[in-house]
C-alpha cells in the first residue's frame, strides 16, 4: 500500500519503569522488573525482568538507573540474550561517594543496536542487593525502532 | 517515486567502537580511533580518528567514554570540522575520585545537530595520555540521521 | 497527499541552549531560560523558561546541565505542565565533590514521552541559586518528534 501523510509508519517505542528489583540468593547481581509506561507498536514486549524483541531491526536503546549506594562504583549492564549467546550492548559506570548522604547518582547510557527476533533484553546491576531508587523518573529503560 | 510500506526510507545509522586511543608527542589531547560495529546507509564513514559526513542533514549524535583516571575532572568534547572552521557540538564532564580504585566513570552525552557534507566529526579528550577503558560497551560513538 | 521521496515528512526537532538561569527571591529552585540553536518543523516553541508543545505526539526529550557547585548532590528535573497538572518526566542526579576545583559535572538524561498540545516543558534545578555553566555545549535541551 502507498503511504499517505496519515498512514506513514511511525516508530515503535517502549518506555519502561520499574516494578521492583531483586537479587536471587547467592547471586552477585541485582535485576530490575519492568512495566510499560508508554508503548506504541507491537514489536516489543515487557516480560518481567526482560524485554522480548518481536520485530527484528535497528533500535535506539536507553537505560537509566538511580543509585543510592556507597559501594565504590555502581552501574548497569544492558545485554541481549538470543540465538544461544549473550552479548553486552552497553554499560554505565559511576563512582560513588563513601558517605551515605552524598551517595546519590543517576547513570544514563544509550546506543543504537541491531536486535533479533526473540532476543531478550535485560538490565543487570552487577552487585548483590544494590540499593536503587526505583522512582519512575529516576530509573527507566526505553526502545525506539529506527 | 512514491514510498510504499517496503520502500520507506530508513534512518542511516552508524555505531562506532574504539580501535585505540593516542596522544601525539607534546599534545595535551587524547584522540580515539574508531571502527564500525553497526552501519546502515552510506552517509557516514569512519576515518580513523574522525567520522566523515557524506550526507548533510540533521543527526542525533551520541558519545560515551569510560574513564579510569584520577585527574580531577575528565570528559570528552565532540566537535565538527568543516568549511574551514571547527565547532564544539557538545561536551561531557565528570569529576573523578583521587583514589585509583574508585576512579572509574563513564561519561555519556548526546544531542541533535545539523552536519554538513564533508564535515569531520571527532571525539577529543582534552588531556594528554588520558587513561581510558576502550571496551566497546564502555566507550562508543554513534549517529542517527533524522 | 501521497508521500514522495522528496516530500517524505521529516522529524521535527528542536535543540535549545541557555540564555540565562535565575532563582526567584525566596525560591528554592533555579530555572533556565532557553533559545533555539536548531529547529526543524513548527511543532515546538521556546517560550522563556519553558517550551510549548504545539503538535501532540511521542517525543524523544534530552537534557544536559553542567554544574559547578559544591552542594552535595545536584541535578535537574524535566517536567511537563498541562491540562491542569504537572508531571515529572525524568531526572538526572549527580553527587558533587566538596572541593570547588573538582566540582564540575555534566548531568545528561533522556527518554521517550507522549506530550500533549499546549504542554509546557521545563528544566528545573531544585536548588536556590545553583551554580551552572551555561555554555551551549555543556547545558542544553532537545526534542525529536518520533
Amino acid at each position: 500500500a502507498v503511504l499517505t501523510q496519515k498512514q506513514k509508519k511511525q516508530h515503535s517505542v517502549l518506555h519502561l519503569v520499574p516494578i521492583n528489583a531483586t537479587s536471587k540468593d547467592d547471586s552477585d547481581v541485582t535485576e530490575v522488573m519492568w512495566q510499560p509506561a508508554l508503548r506504541r507498536g507491537r514489536g516489543l514486549q515487557a516480560q518481567g525482568y526482560g524485554v522480548r524483541i518481536q520485530d527484528a531491526g535497528v533500535y535506539l536503546l536507553y537505560s537509566q538507573v538511580l543509585f543510592q549506594d556507597v559501594t565504590f562504583t555502581m552501574g548497569q549492564v544492558v545485554s541481549r540474550e538470543g540465538q544461544g549467546r549473550q552479548e553486552t550492548l552497553f554499560r554505565c559506570i559511576r563512582s560513588m561517594p563513601s558517605h551515605p548522604d552524598r551517595a546519590y547518582n543517576s547513570c544514563y547510557s544509550a546506543g543504537v543496536f541491531h536486535l533479533h527476533q526473540g532476543d531478550i533484553l535485560s538490565v543487570i546491576i552487577p552487585r548483590a542487593r544494590a540499593k536503587l531508587n526505583l522512582s519512575p523518573h529516576g530509573t527507566f529503560l526505553g526502545f525506539v525502532k529506527l | 517515486a512514491v514510498l510504499t510500506q517496503k520502500q520507506k526510507k530508513q534512518h542511516s545509522v552508524l555505531h562506532l567502537v574504539p580501535i585505540n586511543a593516542t596522544s601525539k608527542d607534546d599534545s595535551d589531547v587524547t584522540e580515539v580511533m574508531w571502527q564500525p560495529a553497526l552501519r546502515r546507509g552510506r552517509g557516514l564513514q569512519a576515518q580513523g580518528y574522525g567520522v566523515r559526513i557524506q550526507d548533510a542533514g540533521v543527526y542525533l549524535l551520541y558519545s560515551q567514554v569510560l574513564f579510569q583516571d584520577v585527574t580531577f575532572t575528565m570528559g570528552q568534547v565532540v566537535s565538527r570540522e568543516g568549511q574551514g572552521r571547527q565547532e564544539t557540538l557538545f561536551r561531557c564532564i565528570r569529576s573523578m575520585p583521587s583514589h585509583p580504585d574508585r576512579a572509574y566513570n563513564s561519561c555519556y552525552s548526546a544531542g541533535v545537530f545539523h552536519l554538513h557534507q564533508g564535515d569531520i566529526l571527532s571525539v577529543i579528550i582534552p588531556r594528554a595520555r588520558a587513561k581510558l577503558n576502550l571496551s566497546p560497551h564502555g566507550t562508543f560513538l554513534g549517529f542517527v540521521k533524522l | 497527499a501521497v508521500l514522495t521521496q522528496k516530500q517524505k515528512k521529516q522529524h521535527s526537532v528542536l535543540h535549545l541552549v541557555p540564555i540565562n538561569a535565575t532563582s526567584k527571591d525566596d525560591s528554592d529552585v533555579t530555572e533556565v531560560m532557553w533559545q533555539p540553536a536548531l529547529r526543524r518543523g513548527r511543532g515546538l516553541q521556546a517560550q522563556g523558561y519553558g517550551v510549548r508543545i504545539q503538535d501532540a505526539g511521542v517525543y524523544l526529550l534530552y537534557s544536559q546541565v553542567l554544574f559547578q557547585d559544591v552542594t552535595f548532590t545536584m541535578g535537574q528535573v524535566v517536567s511537563r505542565e498541562g491540562q491542569g497538572r504537572q508531571e515529572t518526566l525524568f531526572r538526572c542526579i549527580r553527587s558533587m565533590p566538596s572541593h570547588p576545583d573538582r566540582a564540575y559535572n555534566s548531568c545528561y538524561s533522556a527518554g521517550v514521552f507522549h506530550l500533549h498540545q499546549g504542554d509546557i516543558l521545563s528544566v528545573i534545578i531544585p536548588r536556590a541559586r545553583a551554580k551552572l555553566n551555561l555554555s551551549p555545549h555543556g547545558t542544553f535541551l532537545g526534542f525529536v518528534k518520533l
Epitope: 541491531h114 | 567502537v17 564500525p36 564513514q45 576502550l134 | -
Partner: antibody
C-alpha cells in the same frame, strides 16, 4: 604481540565450498573487526569485506556478496571466511587483516586453488 | 566503485636512489589513502595512511603526499630491503579498493 595465523593451502573442486580460518592472539578478539583481502597470482589486492567480531556485523564488497560469508568463533579467537560455488576465478591467496579503514596487521595468507 | 590507478607498473632503481610512485583516484578521495609494501611470498605491510601519516615503525625515508585525486609515495635513499611491490588503497568509503601495484626492482 598481535598475530594472525591463517589455515593452510586448499585444493578444491569447482562448484564446491571452502572455509578458511584466521586464528588471532595478542589482543582482545571481540573488540576489533577483521578484514579479508583477495590476491590473485601475480595480481593486485581486492577487499572482500569486514566483520566486527563483537556482534557479528559484516560489510561486504558488492562483488563478493553471495560468494563470501564472514563468521567468527569467540571461544577460539578465530575468524572464518567461507567461499561458495567456487570457480577458477576464486583461485587466489586470501589474507585476513586487522583494523579499519587501513590494515595494520596481516595474516600470512591462505592459498586456494580451484581445479578439477 | 572508486578506481585506483598506479604508475609506473614497474621501475628499476639502485640502492641510494630516490624514487616516486604515483596513484590516481577516479574521484576526489580527499586525503584518505594508504600505501603498502609487499615482498615476494609475504603479506602486505602498512607504510602510510591518511595520505601522509607514517605507520609505526616505518623508516623516515618513506613519505606520502597528495590529496584529492593525485597521490605519491617517495622513497629517499633506497635500501636493499625496499625492493618489492607497492600498492595504494583508498579508505574513503567501502568498498575499499587498491591500485594495480608498482614493482620496484634493483637495477
Amino acid at each position: 604481540e598481535v598475530q594472525l595465523q591463517q589455515s593452510g593451502a586448499e585444493l578444491v573442486r569447482p562448484g564446491s565450498s571452502v572455509k578458511m580460518s584466521c586464528k588471532t592472539s595478542g589482543y582482545t578478539f571481540t573488540s576489533y573487526g577483521i578484514n579479508w583481502v583477495k590476491q590473485r597470482p601475480g595480481q593486485g589486492l581486492e577487499w572482500i569485506g569486514y566483520i566486527y567480531i563483537g556482534n557479528g556485523y559484516a560489510e561486504y564488497n558488492e562483488r563478493f556478496k553471495g560468494k563470501a560469508t564472514l563468521t567468527s568463533d569467540t571461544s577460539s579467537s578465530t575468524a572464518y571466511m567461507q567461499l561458495s560455488s567456487l570457480t577458477s576465478e576464486d583461485s587466489a591467496i586470501y589474507f585476513c587483516a586487522l583494523y579499519y579503514p587501513w590494515f595494520t596487521y596481516w595474516g600470512q595468507g591462505t592459498l586456494v586453488t580451484v581445479s578439477a | 566503485d572508486i578506481q585506483m590507478t598506479q604508475s609506473p607498473a614497474s621501475l628499476s632503481a639502485s640502492v641510494g636512489d630516490s624514487v616516486t610512485i604515483t596513484c590516481r583516484a577516479s574521484e576526489n578521495i580527499y586525503s584518505y589513502l594508504a600505501w603498502y609494501q609487499q615482498k615476494q611470498g609475504k603479506s602486505p605491510q602498512l607504510l602510510v595512511y591518511n595520505a601522509k601519516t607514517l605507520a609505526e615503525g616505518v623508516p623516515s625515508r618513506f613519505s606520502g603526499s597528495g590529496s584529492g585525486t593525485q597521490f605519491s609515495l617517495k622513497i629517499n635513499s633506497l635500501q636493499p630491503e625496499d625492493f618489492g611491490n607497492y600498492y595504494c588503497q583508498h579508505h574513503y568509503d567501502t568498498p575499499f579498493t587498491f591500485g594495480g601495484g608498482t614493482k620496484l626492482e634493483i637495477k
